[in-house]
Interface confidence: low
């Protein structure tokens, strides 16, 4: 549950009180500092005389509830907690076309961690207009593109000028392709390999498969310079090796220089493309291995080893790299690329005009529609500190509550705000403050987190020669006496010289004088038992660690152990406090407990005979929900099947909706229509009755593979 705490800067910071029942329990430890470092649930009672005579001072270290239950006043509890202070929190704002925008808030916070205790805070991100763009221009340099090359040389500046209308951060790069350098794709006559163009006088480069020429850069002059150095080449057959080039451009992210921003790949050609299988014509049988194979000069060196990739491979690589391809092609090949567009997600096709101005417009349109991803990243953490993110995206793809080592939201639109909940946790103390930086990949703004750890008790300075410690025989700190040399006992009341006196030992034995001193669970000091560990009582006869355990945890973590008996917290019961009094897990979607076919015990349904399932909602011999609703799903969605004639009557209590939900996990029913067409549906219980979400199956595609 989230509380709001007013920080020292006067602003509100959200934080989460840690669930103290997690991860083991608090063990007795003999000093306040060691106590608070031993487990995040540990507190220390500094009240004078809190421990009974002879009881180990280590028993001052316990869980807060236990200490309170044992009579420690709240104000005497030493329980430092982690905290947060917001140091700078400029409100999110658009700025002017991304210029001067505040996209990340807060900008600076101070987080103090208590080892073992998580601290959770919210980071907000506003996608301002002006999201960065990486654009890689991939050009067919076969001889037929000679005239286009001249136009493309002028394109760099135009691209930046237009793209800077919508973004303040642009990177453009350039690559080129021809085809595999083996017959029948290119001529292998030596003179033709060296100079494949028709005229000996024109500038022409030897054929190549793919050449990455210019890594993504913000420098239009570099684009123009590098493109200006290019010459056309030549090949024999009509289709080109563009798929090899696209795949390498998608896979070789480091070499291309792709950032984690909107990624566009502009593919220009005047012809079609070779695809998987065509390599066999040139004696290449090994399928494309889906790996980057660029040498230090940016040349695809393995083109004669691997076949062309399939359409599926190209689509998968582009999708995985979050690259949106824009096919800018001449009129004759347009229909082929329009078909290709259907098979590649988030792709666009346009006809290449004489002056290439529509390529720029195509890019503008594609950029506008591109769904962007916001990824919250962090700088290196100091040893012993961990971080996790929950992303609250408020879009079609919510990732509510899923923790990961980076925050991510997909399909974040301009003006949309997304939230990330960041959890920091330390396992031990930091030797010094650490500055942690959080930023959304591709954006300049950062959240600076000043990381500190709290590792000391705040009991104040030790009181030397305290009267409490037998009139000055020791120093008092955090409620316990540190005895002067030669003095012993809880209150330093005993001299070492008195230790061996047999008379004193009688106070450490049972009245009958038999059995070991202090029940064998402590030391006899000054005629009193000083118990060790979890033992207590005048003779250490009571063991506060011998209670029943649930799942290996003493009193299930929901109570405290006192002399072998669990004293459970208010909402738990049972000999090991293993039983929750809550019934949340027993409530059926329709309301009611255990679907009316069982009773709730320890927050778990105990089903009556013949019923089973977590909510007793399934029965032996009954139809499964899939069987039960298959015919209603078919007739409601497609108007076919055995109930087609009287669907509205038989399925009156069922609401059927069509969906294009992308994930078909285990909850989906997989059935076939009367004409053997595969379809999927999901049975949901709503207040209004049963809802069937039906996904029609595309012909020839099996989503279960």
């Amino acid at each position: 549950e989230l509380d709001t705490k007013i920080t020292s800067s006067g602003e509100a910071a959200e934080w989460e009180d840690p669930d103290l029942s997690l991860q083991g329990s608090c063990q007795p430890v003999p000093s306040c500092q060691k106590c608070i470092l031993s487990h995040p649930s540990c507190a220390w009672c500094k009240q004078l005389n809190f421990t009974a005579s002879g009881e180990a001072e280590a028993r001052r270290c316990a869980r807060r509830e236990e200490l309170l239950a044992r009579g420690c006043p709240a104000q005497e509890l030493e329980e430092p907690r982690g905290r947060q202070e917001v140091l700078q929190d400029k409100p999110l704002s658009q700025g002017d076309r991304g210029e001067g925008a505040t996209q990340l808030a807060p900008q600076r916070i101070r987080v103090t961690l208590r080892p073992g205790e998580p601290q959770k805070f919210r980071v907000r991100f506003l996608r301002a207009a002006g999201y960065p763009v990486d654009l890689y221009y991939l050009m067919d340099l076969s001889y037929s593109m000679k005239d286009d090359l001249e136009r493309v040389r002028q394109l760099g500046h135009a691209l930046l000028v237009r793209l800077q209308e919508v973004t303040h951060s642009v990177r453009i790069g350039f690559g080129s392709f021809v085809d595999k350098t083996v017959l029948p794709f290119v001529s292998t006559v030596p003179s033709k390999l060296h100079h494949p163009c028709p005229s000996r006088l024109e500038r022409c480069q030897p054929p190549f498969s793919f050449h990455h020429v210019l890594s993504l850069t913000g420098d239009a002059q570099a684009f123009e310079r590098e493109v200006g150095r290019q010459n056309v080449s030549g090949n024999l057959d009509s289709p080109e090796g563009g798929f090899d080039a696209i795949l390498q451009a998608a896979l070789c992210q480091e070499q291309i220089g792709w950032r984690n921003v909107s990624r566009l790949l502009v593919f220009t050609s005047d012809d079609t493309f070779h695809t998987a299988g065509d390599g066999k014509l040139g004696g290449i049988f090994m399928p494309s291995d889906g790996r980057c194979h660029l040498d230090s000069n940016g040349v695809y060196t393995n083109s004669a080893e691997f076949d062309y990739p399939s359409v599926g491979q190209v689509a998968q690589a582009l999708t995985a790299a979050n690259i949106q391809p824009i096919f800018a092609v001449t009129g004759a090949t347009l229909p082929v690329y329009q078909e290709l567009r259907q098979l590649i997600p988030k792709s666009a096709v346009g006809e290449l005009s004489e002056d290439s101005s529509n390529v720029v417009q195509l890019i503008m349109d594609a950029y506008d529609s591109l769904s962007s991803t916001v990824t919250l990243e962090h700088s290196p953490l100091p040893p012993g500190v961990s971080i996790s993110f929950e992303s609250h995206c408020k879009g079609p793809e919510k990732t509510e509550g899923e923790a990961g080592d980076r925050g991510q939201c997909n399909d974040v639109r301009v003006n949309q705000t997304v939230d990330f909940w960041v959890t920091l946790q330390a396992t031990h103390c930091l030797p010094e403050a650490h500055v942690l930086r959080l930023w959304a990949l591709g954006f300049s703004e950062e959240l600076t987190v000043e990381l500190h750890t709290v590792c000391d008790c705040n009991c104040g300075d030790a009181q030397p020669h305290a009267p409490y410690c037998s009139d000055g025989q020791g120093d008092l700190q955090c409620g316990i006496c540190s005895c002067a040399p030669g003095r012993l006992g809880q209150l330093c009341e005993c001299s070492e010289a008195d230790l061996s006196s047999p008379d004193l030992e009688s106070g450490c034995r049972a009245p009958n004088g038999t059995g070991p001193l202090c029940s064998g669970k402590g030391r006899c000091q000054c005629g009193r038992c000083s118990c060790s560990g979890q033992s207590s009582g005048r003779l250490c006869e009571c063991d506060d660690a011998s209670c029943e355990r649930h799942e290996g945890i003493l009193c299930g973590g929901f109570g405290h152990c006192q002399c072998g008996v669990c004293h459970c917290h208010a909402n738990h019961t049972g000999r090991a406090c293993e039983c929750s009094k809550s019934v949340d897990s027993c409530v059926s979607p329709e309301g009611g407990l255990c679907s009316g076919h069982g009773y709730c015990k320890c927050n778990r349904c105990q089903c009556l005979d013949g019923y089973y399932g977590a909510l007793c909602d399934q029965c032996l011999g009954c139809k499964s929900p899939c069987e039960q609703y298959r015919d209603c799903a078919e007739c409601g969605a497609f108007g076919t099947g055995p109930l087609a004639a009287n669907c509205s009557v038989v399925c009156a209590d069922v609401n059927v909706t069509l969906t294009l939900a992308p994930n078909l996990d285990d909850g989906w029913c997989k059935e076939r229509t009367i004409d053997n067409q595969l379809f999927f549906f999901l049975v949901e219980h709503a207040a209004s009755g049963i809802v069937l979400r039906v996904r029609p199956q595309e012909k020839g595609v099996d989503h279960t593979r």
């Epitope: 700025g95 210029e99 001067g100 930046l160 642009v170 913000g218 239009a220 290196p380 010094e432 650490h434």
Partner: antibody, heavy 117, light 107 residues
Framework: EVQLQESGPGLVKPSQSLSLTCSVT????????WGWIRKFPGNKMEWMGY???????SYNPSLKSRISITRDTSKNQFFLQLNSVTTEDTATYYC???????????WGPGTMVTVSS | DVVMTQSPATLSVTPGERISLSCRAS??????LHWYQQKPNESPRLLIK???QSISGIPSRFSGSGSGTDFTLSINGVELEDLSIYYC?????????FGAGTKLELK
């Protein structure tokens, strides 16, 4: 190749404002961070501040009340203004390309500014 | 501010020898430590970034090491053209701060 060139008056009177321009070629200042550094006669170097590609600024706290860094993206220039100068501000002023990791990979040749009456 | 301390202030060298320059930060700067070379009447030139990463175009005789608070710039086989002032600079926290420099001179 990224090139930077500082320009501005070489002599400024005490209590007046020092204004310098950095002209950048080969790179849009709407990418990266662009900073000012100065080197005093005793060879001591001081980071003065930067303007980021989004236009946000960060200044050295020792100068915060006197410094302003602005830019003109249309001219691909960014500017330094330092108010109320004293003879202690006599130094060679450099503009440089930088980033959030703090290093300066491209520098201008520097311009010497003397504060004297 | 993070105070950067360089030592020695001046180092007399013989061409061909291997030398090490030291830079110490008053608090941890992780590996956000960069080295520059500045020759007379020239602007500084980046030699090493992130404590140990080499820069394209910088001779391989220059190398860097260290993290946290202690860093070293090594020159394996000093050449006459290396006689300059060398600065370290931290970029871990603002304000970025420089060391006072180590001047390399001929023995």
């Amino acid at each position: 190749e990224v090139q930077l060139q500082e320009s501005g008056p070489g002599l400024v009177k005490p209590s007046q404002s020092l204004s310098l321009t950095c002209s950048v070629t080969g790179f849009f200042i709407t990418n990266n961070y662009w900073g000012w550094i100065r080197k005093f006669p005793g060879n001591k170097m001081e980071w003065m501040g930067y303007i980021s590609y989004s236009g946000s600024t960060s200044y050295n706290p020792s100068l915060k009340s006197r410094i302003s860094i602005t830019r003109d993206t249309s001219k691909n220039q960014f500017f330094l203004q330092l108010n109320s100068v004293t003879t202690e501000d006599t130094a060679t002023y450099y503009c440089a390309m930088t980033g959030s990791s703090g290093y300066f990979d491209f520098w201008g040749p520097g311009t010497m500014v003397t504060v004297s009456s | 501010d993070v105070v950067m301390t360089q030592s020695p202030a001046t180092l007399s060298v013989t061409p061909g020898e291997r030398i090490s320059l030291s830079c110490r930060a008053s608090e941890s700067v992780d590996t956000y430590l960069h080295w520059y070379q500045q020759k007379p009447n020239e602007s500084p030139r980046l030699l090493i970034k992130y404590a140990s990463q080499s820069i394209s175009g910088i001779p391989s005789r220059f190398s860097g090491s260290g993290s946290g608070t202690d860093f070293t710039l090594s020159i394996n086989g000093v050449e006459l053209e290396d006689l300059s002032i060398y600065y370290c600079q931290q970029g871990n926290s603002l304000p970025n701060t420089f060391g006072a420099g180590t001047k390399l001179e001929l023995k």
